[in-house]
């Protein structure tokens, strides 16, 4: 896993993160975990990074992922509202210049690579739709979530707004 | 434009369940949070709960075992209701709209004008 | 629960005055922190969200900073529409708390 080391290298100059001229309206560290407590960690196996959802020992250090939280409209005409409303957008960096992508081809949650401007599939939509949990929904995809398969992360099609409590897409950020 | 108006009884009795209405407009109820705050007089503003856009709803610890939030997405309403009240429930009811959709973390600029609620006999 | 706390409690200040207002969270609530003002028998109003992030509408006296556990709100040249109650409130964990409010009166 990455540990805190590796995040800490971040600075400010390394996150003007601009999407399209977009600076993030806030940044910071937290470790992510499944409403079930097991946390989200990351390794580098053979030249690539993999993702894992596991139970971690009693004192190991949990992962950390730079979370940049992004501002952007909500057309009235996609929210069936009267007016146009504010939505927040997040990225998930667990280690410099890598973000967490989502692939809706494979359905899948993957590392890339990549320099800024970031794409479109590297932005999911912030839900906190249960208590002190948050759910992911992919920008490329509405309706598409982050959630937990067999201990990895995957594209999660939900189909109705009651669902959005479902266990599997619901997640815990923590700065400690 | 965004509208928020809270409705119910300006006089409940001790021990009685107090009952209020949140109506909205401008904007759907499966795409927004709405908030219960009071204030009661003299004192601060006083967070009571929320119901998300998906349904789930969250409440002061304090107040947990009273309260209960619910809504109708269809006719644009939540509802308020606080159970075995007494005279330190007497505050003004304001109900408020998240600031970003399906999330709450931006607070609330949008607030009804609040409604007086007493409990006396 | 989260505990926020607000200070000072009052404070009586000129037109013109540069006025800060401080609130203190019981534990890290990242940027999640709004501050509202509040005018006798009106509603509250939202002036900053996201810790400095300015409300649609609100003047550019207003002011927010901090993260983590310590914010402050700043009015850099008090107006006199601007007496008035001020409030932060954490949005990281429910329940959501409000702070015990600053009354800021004329001097």
């Known amino acids: 896993a990455f540990g805190i080391s590796g995040v800490q290298k971040y600075t400010r100059a390394l996150h003007d993160s601009s999407i399209t001229g977009i600076s993030p309206i806030t940044e910071y560290l937290a470790s992510l975990s499944t409403y079930n407590d097991q946390s989200i960690t990351f390794a580098l196996e053979d030249e690539s990074y993999e993702i894992y959802v596991e139970d971690l020992k009693k004192d190991e250090k949990k992962d950390k992922v730079l979370l940049s939280y992004y501002e952007s409209q909500h057309p009235s005409n996609e929210s069936g509202d009267g007016v146009d409303g504010k939505m927040l957008m997040v990225t998930l960096s667990p280690t410099k210049d890598f973000w967490l992508h989502a692939n809706n081809k494979e359905h899948s949650v993957e590392l890339h690579k990549c320099e800024k401007p970031l794409p479109d599939q590297a932005f999911f939509v912030l839900h906190n739709m249960h208590s002190n949990c948050v759910s992911f929904e992919c920008k490329t995809d509405p309706g598409v979530f982050i959630g937990v398969k067999d201990n990895h992360l995957a594209l999660i099609k939900v189909d109705s707004s009651e669902n959005l409590c479902t266990e599997n897409i619901l997640f815990k950020l923590s700065e400690t | 434009q965004v509208q928020l108006q809270e409705s119910g009884p300006g006089l409940v009795k001790p021990s009685e369940t107090l009952s209020l209405t949140c109506t909205v407009s401008g904007f759907s109820l499966t795409n927004y949070g709405v908030h219960w705050i009071r204030l009661p007089p003299g004192k601060g503003l006083e967070w009571i709960g929320v119901?998300?856009?998906?349904?789930?709803?969250d409440y002061n610890s304090a107040l947990m075992s009273r309260v209960t939030i619910s809504k109708d997405n269809s006719k644009s309403q939540v509802s308020l209701k606080l159970s075995s009240v007494t005279a330190a429930d007497t505050a003004v009811y304001y109900c408020?709209?998240?600031?970003?959709?399906?999330?709450?973390?931006?607070?609330?600029?949008?607030w009804g004008q609040g409604t007086l609620v007493t409990v006396s006999s | 629960d989260i505990q926020m706390t607000q200070s000072p409690s009052s404070l009586s200040a000129s037109v013109g005055d540069r006025v800060t207002i401080t609130c203190l969270a019981s534990q890290t609530i990242a940027t999640w922190l709004a501050w509202y003002q509040q005018k006798p028998g009106k509603s509250p109003k939202l002036l900053i969200y996201?810790?400095?992030r300015l409300a649609d509408g609100v003047p550019s006296r207003f002011s927010g900073s901090g993260s983590g556990t310590d914010f402050t709100l700043t009015i850099s040249s008090l107006q006199p529409e601007d007496f008035a109650t001020y409030y932060c409130?954490?949005?990281?964990?429910?329940?959501?708390?409000f702070g015990q409010g600053t009354k800021v009166e004329i001097k």
């Open positions: 996201a810790a400095t």
């Open positions: 409130q954490q949005l990281y964990n429910t329940p959501y708390t």
């Open positions: 119901i998300r856009a998906g349904g789930s709803s």
């Open positions: 408020a709209r998240d600031h970003y959709f399906s999330n709450s973390y931006g607070g609330s600029p949008y």
